[in-house]
Interface confidence: low
């Protein structure tokens, strides 16, 4: 498999056949896949050298290793996007040999002299062919000659498989299957071959191809394939449930920051809620997870405006439950990125030197931004797009939680709507979903660089649009929802967190 | 606008041949596969034949396989079926379609086999 | 081969309704589906491909959905030139076949 470790080093050479069997409109649906596992790979901060080859009768190197810029991913999409069915029209037969020659010559060193740490670069072959060579010869005699230079197969005590894969994905009208697979590497309980039906399920694809063990931590990381759980691809989520005997219980969501520690809202909680008589399960698993405290932010007292006429004052409604005992890590439990952590600046790609004041920039411009909450529905974790009106939407956003229930009779609206919210809902620019009892403490999230980034928790909604836990479908146009901005509230989470790793800015 | 015109139609006796052209335009045709599907009277569609684009691929289902040849010339954007051994059950209306799935079609040239 | 098999063969509907037809293939096509319309006299026409992806110009009230085995065209709410007979056709593999058609018609 592809080892993505962001310490390892890895040269990936991306194949393509552009002969005439293939077709323009395959040649660019092969293209779009390539593109994706680029992307694919970035979003694991791992940095490979790629070498980029299109062929026909004769192959075309567009990007070599040995360049520059051949690790930087964005770079070689560029080049990839740029390349043209076109450019093989002259000289249109299938020489897979000749192609994969060039891959030899990238792999090879000059005076066949191997450098420094040869024998530690991962090679990873991603084919993408129908398999009619018509000339050349057999290609598999290069394969051969590849696992010849790389010293693999050849030591009994050391047989060094894992440094070579060759994947091969059938594209095109017809597919010779026998040529395909004699070609792709062969490797028990992993797939080295791929049909174009694949292709339409590229997730499934990559969830087959990637071996992520070394990079469970990174925070934010999703895996959407279609067999995986709510909880591949919500692995931060947490569920919440405090009992409270004779009162029934309160049901809350969280987001998993750390091996150690849950981030909600602080109102899920009373000061009476012994620790014992709060649930808190992961990852989708039925047992619960043993709760060592509950922090509440300092500044937050539901009751502090009570005399000022304002039932429930919901600033920095925010908590952090400590956990006993460590979260083992895995694709249904990991943790989401914080803002202002080097998880964020790695996972957004941005320079290492990135403030944290580039990435509230980056995460929560002045306008309206995309952003999504997870909630749960009939049993199942769904995502639901809102946009956070922090543009000239914002005001009339915030105007709106005079229609809460209490807040009617509050002169100013910035007695309840506080510098530490961030306000979704409402039908512009589109109609958003709306949170319900249940989504509270859940993250605010936004989606970039194929990862996600918690922005916000989420605290109170102006209309309960939840009636019977079904969420109605017709709601007014004031139906807003209140989320505490994590921004906010960073010199209280770089305390708690402080011995969690997170790098905070 | 991509524009698709068949021609070449006509009666044929049984065992007898025809040949049928498209002439395209609107778009760059030597970067399409082409396909010939025929539609009976009053039946539904059936795929005859497909090429890629620079000719050296053709594909044909059973029923007309070693009977008929498709074929191209891209320097005149042109499109051809080349039919012989013709059947009654080769009666049908025969439309030329861009690419896989079809995105354009012409209007058909009709193709009648009968004594 | 692969079969496409279409249901209903007939339907009837009227104007503003939401009607739904559905297309099984005898073994997985992935989502390589398309469907189109045909009216009397005409070629057909690409509605959409890819089980889901809507063909340029096709209005929204025209929708595909489905992978594997079952597909399914929806229009959300009939106009008086909807009607007309659709096709599903698989693109997966050759040879390349079509369903044998759902008449829409005026009830």
């Known amino acids: 498999k592809i080892v993505l470790d962001p310490s390892g080093s890895m040269n990936i050479y991306l194949v393509l056949d552009g002969s005439d069997s293939i077709g323009a409109s395959n040649f660019t649906g092969a293209k779009k896949c390539l593109v994706n596992l680029i992307e694919k790979v970035a979003s694991y901060g791992v940095k490979p050298r790629y070498g980029l080859v299109t062929y026909a009768t004769y192959p075309k190197i567009w990007v070599k290793v040995s360049e520059a810029d051949s690790s930087n991913a964005d770079w070689v999409t560029k080049q990839l996007n740029e390349i043209n069915y076109e450019d093989h029209k002259l000289k249109s037969g299938t020489n897979t040999k000749k192609a994969l020659q060039a891959v030899y010559s990238m792999m090879s060193w000059p005076d066949d002299v191997p450098p420094e740490g040869w024998n530690r670069t991962r090679h990873v072959i991603i084919l993408m062919t129908d398999g009619l060579h018509n000339m050349g010869g057999d290609p598999i005699t290069v394969i051969d000659e590849i696992r010849d230079l790389l010293y693999i197969g050849k030591d009994r005590k050391n047989p060094r498989e894992d440094y070579l894969d060759v994947y091969v994905f059938g594209v095109g009208p017809l597919v010779n299957q026998v040529n395909i697979n004699a070609l792709a590497s062969k490797k028990d309980n992993e797939q080295h071959v791929f049909k174009v039906k694949d292709m339409e399920n590229l997730e499934d694809v990559f969830y087959q191809m990637i071996d992520e063990s070394q990079s469970l931590s990174l925070c934010g990381m999703v895996w959407e394939h279609r067999k995986g759980t709510d909880y591949h691809k919500q692995p931060w989520q947490a569920k919440i449930s405090v009992i409270r005997p004779s009162k029934g219980h309160e049901s809350c969501m969280g987001a998993v920051v750390s091996e150690y520690f849950v981030l909600t809202a602080a109102h899920c909680f009373t000061v009476d809620d012994k620790e014992h008589s709060i649930k808190v399960s992961v990852g989708g698993e039925k047992r619960d997870l043993e709760i060592e405290v509950v922090l509440f932010h300092p500044n937050y007292n539901i009751n502090g405006k009570k005399e000022a006429g304002i039932p429930e004052f919901y600033d920095y409604d925010v908590a952090l439950i400590k956990l006993k005992n460590k979260l083992k890590y895995g694709q249904t439990i990991r943790p989401i990125c914080l803002p202002c952590t080097e998880g964020t600046t790695r996972a957004l790609r941005l320079p290492p030197t990135t403030t944290c004041q580039q990435q509230k920039e980056e995460l929560l411009p002045a306008q309206d931004i995309k952003a999504l909450f997870v909630s749960e529905e009939e049993k199942k974790l769904t995502r639901k797009e809102v946009y956070i009106k922090n543009g000239d939407k914002k005001g009339s956003c915030e105007r709106d939680a005079q229609y809460a229930p209490g807040y009617d009779k509050v002169k100013d609206i910035s007695e309840v709507v506080t510098p530490r919210f961030l306000c979704t809902g409402g039908v512009s620019p589109y109609a958003d979903p709306n949170t319900c009892r249940g989504d509270s403490g859940g993250p605010l999230i936004v989606h970039k660089r194929s990862r996600f980034i918690q922005v916000g928790v989420i605290s109170w909604g102006v209309v309960d649009v939840c009636k019977n836990q079904k969420r109605q479908k017709q709601v007014p146009a004031h139906a807003r929802d209140f989320h505490i901005n994590l921004f906010q509230v960073l010199p209280w989470l770089k305390e708690k967190l402080q011995d969690e790793d997170l790098g905070f800015l | 606008e991509v524009q698709l015109v068949e021609s070449g139609g006509g009666l044929v006796k049984p065992g007898g041949s025809l040949r049928l052209s498209c002439a395209a335009s609107g778009f760059t045709f030597s970067n399409y596969a082409m396909s010939w599907v025929r539609q009976a009277p009053g039946k539904g569609l059936e795929w005859v034949a497909t090429i890629s684009n620079r000719g050296s691929y053709t594909y044909y289902p059973d029923s007309v396989k070693g009977r008929f040849t498709i074929s191209r010339d891209n320097a005149k954007n042109s499109l051809y079926l080349q039919m012989s051994s013709l059947r009654s059950e080769d009666t049908a209306l025969y439309y030329c379609?861009?690419?896989?799935?079809?995105?354009?079609w012409g209007q058909g040239t009709s193709v009648t086999v009968s004594s | 081969d692969i079969q496409m098999t279409q249901s209903p063969s007939t339907l009837s509907a009227s104007v503003g309704d939401r009607v739904t037809i559905t297309c099984r293939a005898s073994?997985?096509?992935?989502?390589?589906v398309a469907w189109y319309q045909q009216k009397p006299g005409q070629p057909p026409k690409l509605l959409i491909y890819?089980?889901?992806t809507r063909h340029t110009g096709v209005p929204d009230r025209f929708s595909g959905s489905g992978s594997g085995t079952d597909f399914t065209l929806t229009i959300s709410s009939l106009q008086a030139e909807d009607f007309a007979t659709y096709y599903c056709h698989q693109h997966s593999s050759n040879p390349l076949t079509f369903g044998q058609g759902t008449k829409l018609e005026i009830k």
């Open positions: 890819w089980a889901s």
């Open positions: 073994q997985d096509v992935g989502t390589a």
């Open positions: 379609a861009r690419e896989r799935p079809m995105d354009y």
